[in-house]
Amino acid sequence: GQFRVIGPRHPIRALVGDEVELPCRISPGKNATGMEVGWYRPPFSRVVHLYRNGKDQDGDQAPEYRGRTELLKDAIGEGKVTLRIRNVRFSDEGGFTCFFRDHSYQEEAAMELKVEDPFYWVSPG
Protein backbone atom coordinates (compact mmCIF):
# COMPACT_ATOMS: atom_id res chain seq x y z
CA GLY A 1 0.00 0.00 0.00
CA GLN A 2 1.00 3.61 -0.40
CA PHE A 3 2.06 5.99 2.34
CA ARG A 4 3.64 9.37 2.95
CA VAL A 5 6.86 9.94 4.87
CA ILE A 6 6.72 12.77 7.37
CA GLY A 7 9.72 14.39 9.00
CA PRO A 8 10.14 17.51 11.13
CA ARG A 9 8.75 20.61 9.43
CA HIS A 10 11.35 22.99 10.85
CA PRO A 11 15.13 22.69 11.13
CA ILE A 12 16.29 20.78 14.18
CA ARG A 13 18.94 22.53 16.26
CA ALA A 14 21.79 20.88 18.14
CA LEU A 15 24.95 21.91 19.93
CA VAL A 16 28.36 20.55 18.98
CA GLY A 17 29.15 17.56 21.19
CA ASP A 18 25.53 16.94 22.14
CA GLU A 19 23.19 14.31 20.75
CA VAL A 20 20.25 15.04 18.50
CA GLU A 21 17.16 13.11 17.45
CA LEU A 22 15.66 13.20 13.95
CA PRO A 23 12.11 11.77 13.93
CA CYS A 24 10.49 10.24 10.87
CA ARG A 25 7.22 8.36 10.34
CA ILE A 26 4.88 7.06 7.69
CA SER A 27 1.26 8.05 7.30
CA PRO A 28 -1.02 6.22 7.50
CA GLY A 29 0.88 4.36 10.18
CA LYS A 30 1.73 0.72 9.45
CA ASN A 31 4.23 -1.87 10.57
CA ALA A 32 7.62 -1.02 9.06
CA THR A 33 9.55 -3.95 10.55
CA GLY A 34 9.92 -5.59 7.14
CA MET A 35 10.80 -2.40 5.31
CA GLU A 36 14.10 -0.85 4.34
CA VAL A 37 14.34 2.31 6.45
CA GLY A 38 17.23 4.72 6.40
CA TRP A 39 18.78 8.14 6.46
CA TYR A 40 21.23 9.39 3.90
CA ARG A 41 22.79 12.75 3.13
CA PRO A 42 22.15 14.27 -0.26
CA PRO A 43 23.51 14.89 -2.81
CA PHE A 44 25.86 11.90 -2.70
CA SER A 45 23.65 9.46 -0.78
CA ARG A 46 26.16 8.90 1.99
CA VAL A 47 24.53 6.45 4.38
CA VAL A 48 23.93 7.82 7.85
CA HIS A 49 21.97 4.81 9.13
CA LEU A 50 20.24 1.84 7.53
CA TYR A 51 17.74 -0.70 8.83
CA ARG A 52 16.64 -3.79 6.94
CA ASN A 53 15.73 -7.43 7.59
CA GLY A 54 14.61 -6.45 11.06
CA LYS A 55 17.99 -5.12 12.13
CA ASP A 56 20.47 -2.28 11.75
CA GLN A 57 22.90 -2.72 8.84
CA ASP A 58 26.27 -1.00 9.00
CA GLY A 59 27.81 -2.44 5.83
CA ASP A 60 27.38 0.77 3.84
CA GLN A 61 27.40 3.30 6.65
CA ALA A 62 29.60 6.33 5.97
CA PRO A 63 32.74 6.23 8.16
CA GLU A 64 31.93 9.57 9.77
CA TYR A 65 28.75 8.10 11.27
CA ARG A 66 30.15 4.76 12.45
CA GLY A 67 29.42 4.32 16.13
CA ARG A 68 27.58 7.64 16.37
CA THR A 69 24.07 6.63 15.32
CA GLU A 70 21.23 4.66 16.83
CA LEU A 71 17.81 3.94 15.41
CA LEU A 72 15.08 4.23 18.05
CA LYS A 73 12.50 1.75 16.86
CA ASP A 74 10.19 1.09 19.80
CA ALA A 75 7.28 2.31 17.65
CA ILE A 76 8.40 0.84 14.32
CA GLY A 77 5.32 -1.37 14.46
CA GLU A 78 3.33 1.83 13.93
CA GLY A 79 5.72 3.20 11.29
CA LYS A 80 7.54 5.61 13.60
CA VAL A 81 11.31 5.76 14.02
CA THR A 82 13.84 8.26 15.29
CA LEU A 83 17.50 8.56 14.37
CA ARG A 84 19.76 9.54 17.26
CA ILE A 85 23.14 11.04 16.38
CA ARG A 86 25.65 11.28 19.20
CA ASN A 87 28.61 13.65 19.55
CA VAL A 88 27.24 16.11 16.98
CA ARG A 89 29.85 17.75 14.75
CA PHE A 90 29.78 20.93 12.69
CA SER A 91 30.03 18.71 9.61
CA ASP A 92 26.62 17.22 10.49
CA GLU A 93 24.94 20.50 9.64
CA GLY A 94 22.76 20.43 6.54
CA GLY A 95 20.26 18.17 4.86
CA PHE A 96 19.26 14.62 5.74
CA THR A 97 16.80 12.41 3.88
CA CYS A 98 14.76 9.76 5.63
CA PHE A 99 13.20 7.01 3.52
CA PHE A 100 10.85 4.08 3.99
CA ARG A 101 10.63 1.40 1.32
CA ASP A 102 8.60 -1.77 1.05
CA HIS A 103 8.48 -4.16 -1.88
CA SER A 104 6.12 -2.08 -3.94
CA TYR A 105 6.51 1.50 -2.80
CA GLN A 106 9.04 4.03 -1.57
CA GLU A 107 8.79 7.55 -0.19
CA GLU A 108 11.18 9.91 1.53
CA ALA A 109 11.26 13.17 3.45
CA ALA A 110 13.94 15.83 3.71
CA MET A 111 14.95 17.47 6.96
CA GLU A 112 17.58 19.93 8.09
CA LEU A 113 19.96 19.98 11.01
CA LYS A 114 21.44 23.23 12.33
CA VAL A 115 24.56 22.85 14.43
CA GLU A 116 25.61 25.56 16.85
CA ASP A 117 28.73 26.21 18.91
CA PRO A 118 27.96 25.89 22.64
CA PHE A 119 30.79 28.30 23.46
CA TYR A 120 29.58 31.06 21.20
CA TRP A 121 27.70 33.57 23.28
CA VAL A 122 26.11 36.76 22.10
CA SER A 123 26.49 39.32 24.87
CA PRO A 124 23.25 41.12 25.73
CA GLY A 125 22.88 44.56 24.09
Epitope: G59, F99, H103
Partner: antibody, heavy 121, light 108 residues
Amino acid sequence: EVQLLESGGGLVQPGGSLRLSCAASGFTFSSYAMSWVRQAPGKGLEWVSAISGSGGSTYYADSVKGRFTISRDNSKNTLYLQMNSLRAEDTAVYYCAKDWVYFGVGSFDYWGQGTLVTVSS
Amino acid sequence: DIQMTQSPSTLSASVGDRVTITCRASQSISSWLAWYQQKPGKAPKLLIYDASSLESGVPSRFSGSGSGTEFTLTISSLQPDDFATYYCQQTHSYSSTTFGQGTKVEIK
Protein backbone atom coordinates in the same frame (compact mmCIF):
# COMPACT_ATOMS: atom_id res chain seq x y z
CA GLU B 1 6.25 -0.95 -17.75
CA VAL B 2 9.62 -2.00 -16.33
CA GLN B 3 12.05 -3.21 -18.98
CA LEU B 4 15.62 -4.46 -18.67
CA LEU B 5 17.58 -5.19 -21.83
CA GLU B 6 21.00 -6.82 -21.64
CA SER B 7 23.62 -6.69 -24.38
CA GLY B 8 27.33 -7.34 -24.88
CA GLY B 9 27.45 -11.10 -24.59
CA GLY B 10 29.36 -13.29 -27.02
CA LEU B 11 32.25 -15.68 -27.49
CA VAL B 12 35.52 -14.81 -25.80
CA GLN B 13 38.77 -16.70 -25.22
CA PRO B 14 39.94 -17.67 -21.73
CA GLY B 15 41.76 -14.76 -20.16
CA GLY B 16 39.82 -12.29 -22.28
CA SER B 17 37.47 -9.48 -21.36
CA LEU B 18 33.89 -8.54 -22.06
CA ARG B 19 31.60 -5.71 -20.99
CA LEU B 20 27.90 -6.33 -20.48
CA SER B 21 25.31 -3.57 -20.48
CA CYS B 22 21.74 -3.43 -19.22
CA ALA B 23 19.46 -0.64 -20.40
CA ALA B 24 16.66 0.04 -17.92
CA SER B 25 13.35 1.84 -18.39
CA GLY B 26 9.95 2.17 -16.73
CA PHE B 27 11.15 3.00 -13.21
CA THR B 28 13.32 5.49 -11.33
CA PHE B 29 16.60 3.74 -12.03
CA SER B 30 18.71 5.64 -9.48
CA SER B 31 16.40 4.64 -6.62
CA TYR B 32 17.09 0.91 -6.80
CA ALA B 33 20.01 -1.44 -6.32
CA MET B 34 20.71 -3.62 -9.34
CA SER B 35 22.31 -7.05 -9.64
CA TRP B 36 23.81 -9.41 -12.17
CA VAL B 37 22.79 -13.06 -11.81
CA ARG B 38 24.14 -15.82 -14.04
CA GLN B 39 23.05 -19.29 -15.05
CA ALA B 40 25.46 -21.81 -16.55
CA PRO B 41 23.95 -24.09 -19.22
CA GLY B 42 21.61 -26.60 -17.55
CA LYS B 43 22.50 -25.31 -14.08
CA GLY B 44 20.93 -23.17 -11.37
CA LEU B 45 21.05 -19.45 -10.59
CA GLU B 46 24.17 -17.81 -9.18
CA TRP B 47 24.27 -14.24 -7.93
CA VAL B 48 27.33 -12.42 -9.29
CA SER B 49 27.36 -8.78 -8.23
CA ALA B 50 25.22 -5.86 -7.08
CA ILE B 51 25.43 -2.09 -6.87
CA SER B 52 23.49 0.40 -4.74
CA GLY B 53 21.11 2.90 -6.28
CA SER B 54 23.60 5.75 -6.11
CA GLY B 55 26.45 3.56 -7.33
CA GLY B 56 28.43 4.30 -4.19
CA SER B 57 28.46 0.73 -2.89
CA THR B 58 29.29 -2.47 -4.76
CA TYR B 59 29.04 -6.13 -3.76
CA TYR B 60 30.57 -9.26 -5.33
CA ALA B 61 30.39 -13.02 -5.10
CA ASP B 62 33.71 -14.58 -4.08
CA SER B 63 33.91 -16.39 -7.42
CA VAL B 64 34.26 -13.12 -9.37
CA LYS B 65 35.88 -10.78 -6.84
CA GLY B 66 38.90 -9.04 -8.32
CA ARG B 67 37.96 -10.02 -11.88
CA PHE B 68 34.55 -8.43 -12.42
CA THR B 69 33.55 -4.80 -11.87
CA ILE B 70 29.96 -3.60 -11.63
CA SER B 71 29.06 0.02 -12.35
CA ARG B 72 26.10 2.15 -13.36
CA ASP B 73 25.40 5.40 -15.16
CA ASN B 74 22.23 6.83 -13.66
CA SER B 75 22.11 9.60 -16.26
CA LYS B 76 21.82 6.90 -18.96
CA ASN B 77 19.74 4.42 -16.92
CA THR B 78 22.32 1.78 -17.67
CA LEU B 79 24.01 -0.95 -15.62
CA TYR B 80 27.37 -2.46 -16.60
CA LEU B 81 29.47 -5.50 -15.81
CA GLN B 82 33.11 -5.42 -16.84
CA MET B 83 34.43 -8.98 -16.91
CA ASN B 84 38.18 -9.57 -17.04
CA SER B 85 40.38 -12.68 -16.82
CA LEU B 86 37.45 -14.78 -18.02
CA ARG B 87 37.45 -18.53 -17.38
CA ALA B 88 35.54 -21.42 -18.91
CA GLU B 89 33.44 -21.62 -15.75
CA ASP B 90 32.16 -18.08 -16.38
CA THR B 91 30.21 -19.41 -19.37
CA ALA B 92 26.55 -18.64 -18.63
CA VAL B 93 23.53 -16.57 -19.45
CA TYR B 94 23.91 -13.31 -17.55
CA TYR B 95 20.74 -11.65 -16.28
CA CYS B 96 20.37 -8.07 -15.12
CA ALA B 97 17.91 -7.87 -12.22
CA LYS B 98 16.19 -4.99 -10.42
CA ASP B 99 16.17 -5.20 -6.64
CA TRP B 100 13.53 -3.77 -4.31
CA VAL B 101 16.14 -2.26 -1.99
CA TYR B 102 18.31 0.84 -2.31
CA PHE B 103 21.38 -0.63 -0.60
CA GLY B 104 22.73 -4.17 -0.38
CA VAL B 105 21.06 -7.20 -1.91
CA GLY B 106 17.43 -8.28 -1.57
CA SER B 107 14.98 -10.08 -3.84
CA PHE B 108 14.61 -9.32 -7.54
CA ASP B 109 11.23 -8.21 -8.84
CA TYR B 110 12.21 -7.67 -12.49
CA TRP B 111 14.70 -9.48 -14.72
CA GLY B 112 16.07 -8.94 -18.20
CA GLN B 113 15.94 -11.63 -20.88
CA GLY B 114 19.62 -12.49 -20.43
CA THR B 115 22.73 -12.39 -22.61
CA LEU B 116 24.92 -15.44 -23.26
CA VAL B 117 28.62 -15.31 -22.49
CA THR B 118 30.70 -18.20 -23.82
CA VAL B 119 34.33 -18.56 -22.73
CA SER B 120 36.11 -21.01 -24.97
CA SER B 121 39.24 -21.35 -27.03
CA ASP C 1 28.09 -18.15 3.23
CA ILE C 2 24.56 -19.36 3.80
CA GLN C 3 23.79 -22.56 1.85
CA MET C 4 20.30 -23.25 0.53
CA THR C 5 19.17 -26.81 -0.14
CA GLN C 6 15.96 -27.62 -2.01
CA SER C 7 14.08 -30.88 -2.09
CA PRO C 8 13.14 -32.71 -4.11
CA SER C 9 15.34 -31.97 -7.12
CA THR C 10 12.62 -33.21 -9.44
CA LEU C 11 8.93 -33.62 -8.75
CA SER C 12 6.46 -35.41 -11.03
CA ALA C 13 2.87 -34.28 -10.65
CA SER C 14 -0.42 -34.00 -12.47
CA VAL C 15 -2.70 -31.04 -13.16
CA GLY C 16 -4.83 -30.43 -10.07
CA ASP C 17 -2.29 -31.88 -7.63
CA ARG C 18 -1.21 -30.08 -4.50
CA VAL C 19 2.55 -29.61 -4.74
CA THR C 20 5.01 -28.76 -1.96
CA ILE C 21 8.66 -27.83 -2.38
CA THR C 22 11.01 -27.51 0.60
CA CYS C 23 13.97 -25.22 1.05
CA ARG C 24 16.40 -25.48 3.97
CA ALA C 25 18.96 -22.89 5.01
CA SER C 26 22.30 -23.78 6.61
CA GLN C 27 21.59 -21.22 9.36
CA SER C 28 18.61 -19.23 10.52
CA ILE C 29 17.48 -16.61 8.01
CA SER C 30 14.34 -15.55 9.91
CA SER C 31 11.71 -14.98 7.20
CA TRP C 32 14.05 -13.47 4.60
CA LEU C 33 13.40 -15.86 1.76
CA ALA C 34 12.10 -15.50 -1.80
CA TRP C 35 10.76 -18.00 -4.34
CA TYR C 36 11.09 -17.78 -8.14
CA GLN C 37 9.64 -19.66 -11.08
CA GLN C 38 11.67 -20.18 -14.25
CA LYS C 39 10.57 -21.67 -17.54
CA PRO C 40 13.05 -22.97 -20.14
CA GLY C 41 14.76 -20.17 -22.05
CA LYS C 42 13.10 -17.49 -19.91
CA ALA C 43 14.15 -15.27 -17.03
CA PRO C 44 13.10 -16.15 -13.48
CA LYS C 45 9.91 -14.59 -12.12
CA LEU C 46 9.45 -13.54 -8.48
CA LEU C 47 6.56 -15.38 -6.80
CA ILE C 48 6.99 -14.94 -3.05
CA TYR C 49 9.12 -12.65 -0.88
CA ASP C 50 9.68 -12.48 2.88
CA ALA C 51 8.77 -16.19 3.02
CA SER C 52 5.03 -15.70 2.67
CA SER C 53 4.20 -12.45 0.85
CA LEU C 54 2.72 -12.96 -2.59
CA GLU C 55 4.22 -10.79 -5.30
CA SER C 56 1.71 -8.60 -7.14
CA GLY C 57 0.07 -10.40 -10.07
CA VAL C 58 0.99 -13.91 -8.89
CA PRO C 59 -1.98 -16.32 -8.68
CA SER C 60 -3.22 -17.09 -5.18
CA ARG C 61 -2.69 -20.83 -5.67
CA PHE C 62 0.96 -20.10 -4.81
CA SER C 63 1.79 -19.70 -1.13
CA GLY C 64 4.89 -19.70 1.01
CA SER C 65 5.49 -20.51 4.64
CA GLY C 66 8.22 -21.15 7.15
CA SER C 67 10.83 -19.29 9.14
CA GLY C 68 14.25 -19.93 10.59
CA THR C 69 15.80 -22.69 8.50
CA GLU C 70 12.87 -24.51 6.88
CA PHE C 71 10.55 -23.10 4.23
CA THR C 72 7.96 -24.42 1.84
CA LEU C 73 6.42 -23.30 -1.43
CA THR C 74 2.97 -24.75 -2.02
CA ILE C 75 0.93 -24.81 -5.22
CA SER C 76 -2.58 -25.65 -4.08
CA SER C 77 -3.83 -26.95 -7.44
CA LEU C 78 -1.21 -27.40 -10.14
CA GLN C 79 -2.07 -25.78 -13.47
CA PRO C 80 -0.54 -26.51 -16.91
CA ASP C 81 1.30 -23.18 -16.75
CA ASP C 82 3.02 -24.18 -13.49
CA PHE C 83 5.32 -26.84 -14.95
CA ALA C 84 8.68 -25.13 -14.48
CA THR C 85 11.74 -24.98 -12.25
CA TYR C 86 11.43 -23.27 -8.86
CA TYR C 87 14.25 -21.64 -6.91
CA CYS C 88 14.45 -20.35 -3.35
CA GLN C 89 16.74 -17.45 -2.46
CA GLN C 90 17.91 -16.28 0.95
CA THR C 91 17.85 -12.50 1.34
CA HIS C 92 19.07 -12.49 4.94
CA SER C 93 22.67 -11.58 4.12
CA TYR C 94 22.98 -7.86 3.58
CA SER C 95 25.70 -7.78 0.93
CA SER C 96 25.25 -11.11 -0.86
CA THR C 97 22.60 -13.70 -1.62
CA THR C 98 22.39 -17.38 -2.48
CA PHE C 99 19.90 -19.54 -4.36
CA GLY C 100 18.83 -23.12 -3.89
CA GLN C 101 19.80 -25.58 -6.63
CA GLY C 102 16.26 -25.64 -8.02
CA THR C 103 13.30 -28.02 -8.13
CA LYS C 104 11.94 -29.07 -11.51
CA VAL C 105 8.18 -29.73 -11.54
CA GLU C 106 7.41 -32.00 -14.47
CA ILE C 107 4.33 -33.72 -15.85
CA LYS C 108 3.71 -37.18 -14.43
